[in-house]
């Protein structure tokens, strides 16, 4: 990860509150779970469940924890060193080209196609042509056969960590 951090995703934390742990930076950097003070003398702990940092850093603020959207389930909570891990609910998936929202999986394949892959949190059902075996592009068909698929079981999480 590049050490150059610009201002996106910064948490509302300035100087350390009395309960926050402090330690000294090592060669100008603070360990994961901390950020640096303005005078560069202290490492200040991130607030559990509110913000985090994953690497050694000289950030002025810890990074804001992601909040899972409606339609997502939280696989693991935000800690001081790791962002929240969110995943699409059963029956929905997140595409690489539209990662901002979970989309409903199709319930079946178009005519002349057969299902070869289940709905997962990161992919729609997969359909191939019965004859050629080539994949379907993914557009929702005008007419669907009554071939239905049950949602796949979640395997690996779709992490939204920064």
């Amino acid at each position: 990860e590049s050490a150059l951090i610009t201002q996106q995703d910064l948490a509302p934390q300035q100087r350390a509150a009395p309960q926050q742990k402090r330690s000294s930076p090592s060669e100008g950097l603070c360990p994961p779970g901390h950020h640096i003070s303005e005078d560069g003398r202290d490492c200040i702990s991130c607030k559990y469940g509110q913000d985090y940092s994953t690497h050694w850093n000289d950030l002025l603020f810890c990074l804001r924890c992601t909040r899972c959207d409606s339609g997502e389930v939280e696989l693991s909570p935000c800690t001081t060193t790791r962002n929240t891990v969110c995943q699409c609910e059963e029956g929905t998936f997140r595409e690489e080209d539209s990662p901002e929202m979970c989309r409903k999986c199709r319930t079946g394949c178009p005519r002349g196609m057969v299902k070869v892959g289940d709905c997962t949190p990161w992919s729609d059902i997969e359909c191939v042509h019965k004859e050629s075996g080539t994949k379907h592009s993914g557009e929702v068909p005008a007419v669907e056969e009554t071939v239905t698929s049950s949602p796949g079981t979640p395997a690996s999480p779709c992490s939204l960590s920064g």
């Epitope: 951090i5 910064l10 948490a11 303005e38 850093n57 000289d58 950030l59």
Partner: antibody, heavy 116, light 110 residues
Framework: EVQLVETGGGLVQPGGSLRLSCAAS????????MSWVRQAPGKGLEWVSA????????YYADSVKGRFTISRDNSKNTLYLQMNSLRAEDTALYYC?????????WGRGTMVTVSS | QSVLTQPPSVSAAPGQKVTISCSGS????????VSWYQQVPGTAPKLLIY???KRPSGIPDRFSGSKSGTSATLGITGLQTGDEADYYC???????????FGGGTKVTVL
């Protein structure tokens, strides 16, 4: 005594560039976050940018993002602001300040005028 | 338009007290420390109050700061002619990820 002295201001045409410098003395410069804050004539204060002690973490105001670049040379105790694609609305007195979320010491400023 | 809202001006007679309000939101004042600055015309801003209510060394106790919810207040007692200046509040805004200021308040000693 903490001292911050800005230089490099002047008159520049729209679309032009300027590089501001801030010479710091009276404190250990290298660990401190440093900032640039500007003030248009007769207007209030507007934060521009901030940089960590090592230069590894940098923050910009939306109004200057992609046009201005903050940097520092700790061996020279100097803070810089490279300003490109300057606009009339960038006309202001530019202050160098120690700190970022609540700067405690400020220089006297250097005037930047963008006009054709 | 400034993110933080201050009254444009306040005035009082010498020896009196003035208060300057600074209103924001949960993303700035509500979750962060507030600083106050004094700027005499033609000079650089000077830190008066930091961490909501702390005074740097050399700042007289006539100046005080407080914060409640999403608003902050600067108080000046025993007003003197030398207090005539513009006063700015400032804090970090976590939504904008930027240091934000109020529009400034001009204090006039009558």
């Amino acid at each position: 005594e903490v001292q911050l002295v800005e230089t490099g201001g002047g008159l520049v045409q729209p679309g032009g560039s300027l590089r501001l410098s801030c010479a710091a003395s009276g404190f250990t410069f290298s660990p401190y976050y440093m900032s640039w804050v500007r003030q248009a004539p007769g207007k209030g204060l507007e934060w521009v940018s901030a940089i960590s002690g090592s230069g590894g973490s940098i923050y910009y105001a939306d109004s200057v993002k992609g046009r201005f670049t903050i940097s520092r040379d700790n061996s020279k105790n100097t803070l810089y602001l490279q300003m490109n694609s300057l606009r009339a609305e960038d006309t202001a007195l530019y202050y160098c300040a120690r700190g970022a979320s609540g700067p405690d010491y400020w220089g006297r400023g250097t005037m930047v005028t963008v006009s054709s | 338009q400034s993110v933080l809202t201050q009254p444009p001006s306040v005035s009082a007679a010498p020896g009196q007290k003035v208060t300057i309000s600074c209103s924001g939101s949960t993303s700035n004042i509500g979750n962060n420390y507030v600083s106050w600055y004094q700027q005499v015309p033609g000079t650089a801003p000077k830190l008066l109050i930091y961490d909501n209510n702390k005074r740097p060394s050399g700042i007289p106790d006539r100046f005080s700061g407080s914060k409640s919810g999403t608003s902050a207040t600067l108080g000046i007692t025993g007003l003197q002619t030398g207090d005539e200046a513009d006063y700015y509040c400032g804090t970090w805004d976590s939504s904008l990820s930027a240091l934000v200021f109020g529009g400034g308040t001009k204090v006039t000693v009558l």
